[in-house]
Interface confidence: low
């Protein structure tokens, strides 16, 4: 007897991090034998949506014309073939930015830092939030994720980097969020350019992936080193 049907592949275009109001397409790719595709959204009635396959039947398109809070969440897809339903795909986490006002990102003591020294990136929100994310442009997403302990809300989070190397140089943004839905993020902060001078190391590795793309298994987040910040936030490496 044949084993279970192979699980489909689920992804989003242009990526899994979408700003409010923008369109996004969710794709589910199964096999040529697929007769129907089904998309489930966590904590929503199931099936969340169903679509007939597009020729040559090995994938289906689920369109979201305008991103709102409704659509943020965790998805899985399935396909039905003549022998039954497939295993679920790996989950896709669709994140919406623009749910809250943008935080402010600054560098202490300065965004111009000498290699080997320390710098702390400070993300500050106007209203208290309990989750902060630091993103480095053209790096895996998210770069750093700080969540407050015991649900305590903070106006800021510290991201210390020590010792700084040339790898830390680049453009950063931060987001704030509430822990009860990490699928809803604030508008991004204005970009902060961290410039590392006096480096004796070789050139920085060339970037390979943009922030808006869902990180694949080959992506290795670039993680600043350093002690756990003392802002009441627990560090989560993801």
């Amino acid at each position: 007897q044949a084993g279970p049907l192979p699980k489909p592949t689920l992804w989003a275009e242009p990526g899994s991090v979408i700003s409010w109001g923008n369109s996004v397409t969710i794709w589910c790719q199964g096999t040529l034998e697929a007769r129907e595709y089904r998309l489930d959204k966590e904590e929503s009635p199931a099936p969340w949506d169903r679509q007939n396959p597009l020729e040559p039947k090995n994938k289906a398109r689920f369109s979201i014309p305008s991103m709102t809070e409704d659509y943020a969440g965790r998805y899985r897809c399935y396909y039905r073939s003549p022998v039954g339903w497939s295993q679920p795909s790996d989950p896709l986490e669709l994140v919406m930015t623009g749910a809250y006002s943008k935080p402010t990102l600054s560098a202490l003591p300065s965004p111009l830092v000498t290699s080997g020294k320390s710098v702390t990136l400070l993300c500050q929100s106007r209203s208290p939030m309990d989750t902060f994310l630091l993103i480095k442009e053209r790096a895996a997403h998210p770069l750093l994720h700080l969540r407050s302990e015991h649900g305590a809300q903070q106006h800021q989070a510290e991201f210390p980097m020590s010792p700084v190397t040339s790898v830390h140089g680049g453009t950063y943004r931060c987001f704030s969020s509430h822990g009860f839905s990490h699928y809803l993020l604030s508008h991004p902060s204005d970009p902060l350019e961290l410039i590392v001078s006096g480096s004796l190391e070789g050139p920085r590795p060339s970037p390979t992936r943009s922030v808006s793309t869902a990180a694949g298994p080959e992506d290795q987040p670039l993680m600043p080193t350093g002690s756990v910040p003392h802002s009441g936030l627990r560090r989560h490496w993801e």
């Epitope: 949506d49 014309p65 409704d70 809250y100 009860f180």
Partner: antibody, heavy 121, light 107 residues
Framework: QVQLQESGPGLVKPSETLSLTCTVS????????WSWIRQPPGKGLEWIGY???????NYNPSLKSRLTISVDTSKNQFSLKLSSVTAADTAVYYC???????????????WGQGTTVTVSS | DIQMTQSPSSLSASVGDRVTITCRAS??????LAWYQQKPGKVPKLLIS???TLQSGVPSRFSGSGSGTDFTLTISSLQPEDVATYYC?????????FGQGTKLEIK
């Protein structure tokens, strides 16, 4: 079958805060928008604001400075607080759920019975 | 903010008449429009949403049309139980503004 029930005082004094709670029964509060709407005597419907189950909110600009909508997922409830009320806030207050089906969201398909709030000294 | 304007504000028609209520948005709202019926002393009921999709259990004499800025609710053959105030509402983005309502009476 999802049902909504508003609760709170029927009489509020001017300048005080109006507080109402909507209890969701027969279903989960998760993954829906939950709204408050009001209707002054003899007048039309006015959208007050919504809260998503995650806590994200959006308010009617004309009420924003006085309005707070919150959610308690553990109790399957969401609440409205309107501060500094005047006689103009006298109305029937409804809670409602924004509808959903197969990947699409639409108008408010489930409503509470409404609760009359009078602002008077 | 986008304004929603309904017309007429009231109308009187005979049983069996074809009745049309219009709703105009001050900006394009695609088809993110809902129509509600509120009978006297009752809770509003969702009839149509999005603009042309009849909700389950709503009689087929009701229909909706339009997209962008101009929308229409039509009752093909007016019945006595259709006496109510009808509201349109946009929901493409907040605020989810209602029209001012159209009061429908039987002649």
């Amino acid at each position: 079958q999802v049902q909504l029930q508003e609760s709170g005082p029927g009489l509020v004094k001017p300048s005080e805060t109006l507080s109402l709670t909507c209890t969701v029964s027969g279903g989960s509060i998760s993954s829906y928008y939950w709204s408050w709407i009001r209707q002054p005597p003899g007048k039309g419907l006015e959208w007050i604001g919504y809260i998503y189950y995650s806590g994200s909110t959006n308010y009617n600009p004309s009420l924003k400075s006085r309005l707070t909508i919150s959610v308690d997922t553990s109790k399957n409830q969401f609440s409205l607080k309107l501060s500094s009320v005047t006689a103009a806030d006298t109305a029937v207050y409804y809670c409602a759920r924004r509808g959903y089906s197969y990947g699409y969201y639409y108008g408010m398909d489930v409503w509470g019975q409404g609760t009359t709030v009078t602002v008077s000294s | 903010d986008i304004q929603m304007t309904q017309s007429p504000s009231s109308l009187s028609a005979s049983v069996g008449d074809r009745v049309t209520i219009t709703c105009r948005a001050s900006q394009d709202i695609s088809n993110y429009l809902a129509w509600y019926q509120q009978k006297p002393g009752k809770v509003p009921k969702l009839l149509i949403s999005p603009a042309s999709t009849l909700q389950s259990g709503v009689p087929s004499r009701f229909s909706g049309s339009g997209s962008g800025t101009d929308f229409t609710l039509t009752i093909s053959s007016l019945q006595p139980e259709d006496v109510a105030t009808y509201y349109c509402q946009k929901y493409n983005s907040a605020p989810w503004t209602f029209g001012q309502g159209t009061k429908l009476e039987i002649k």
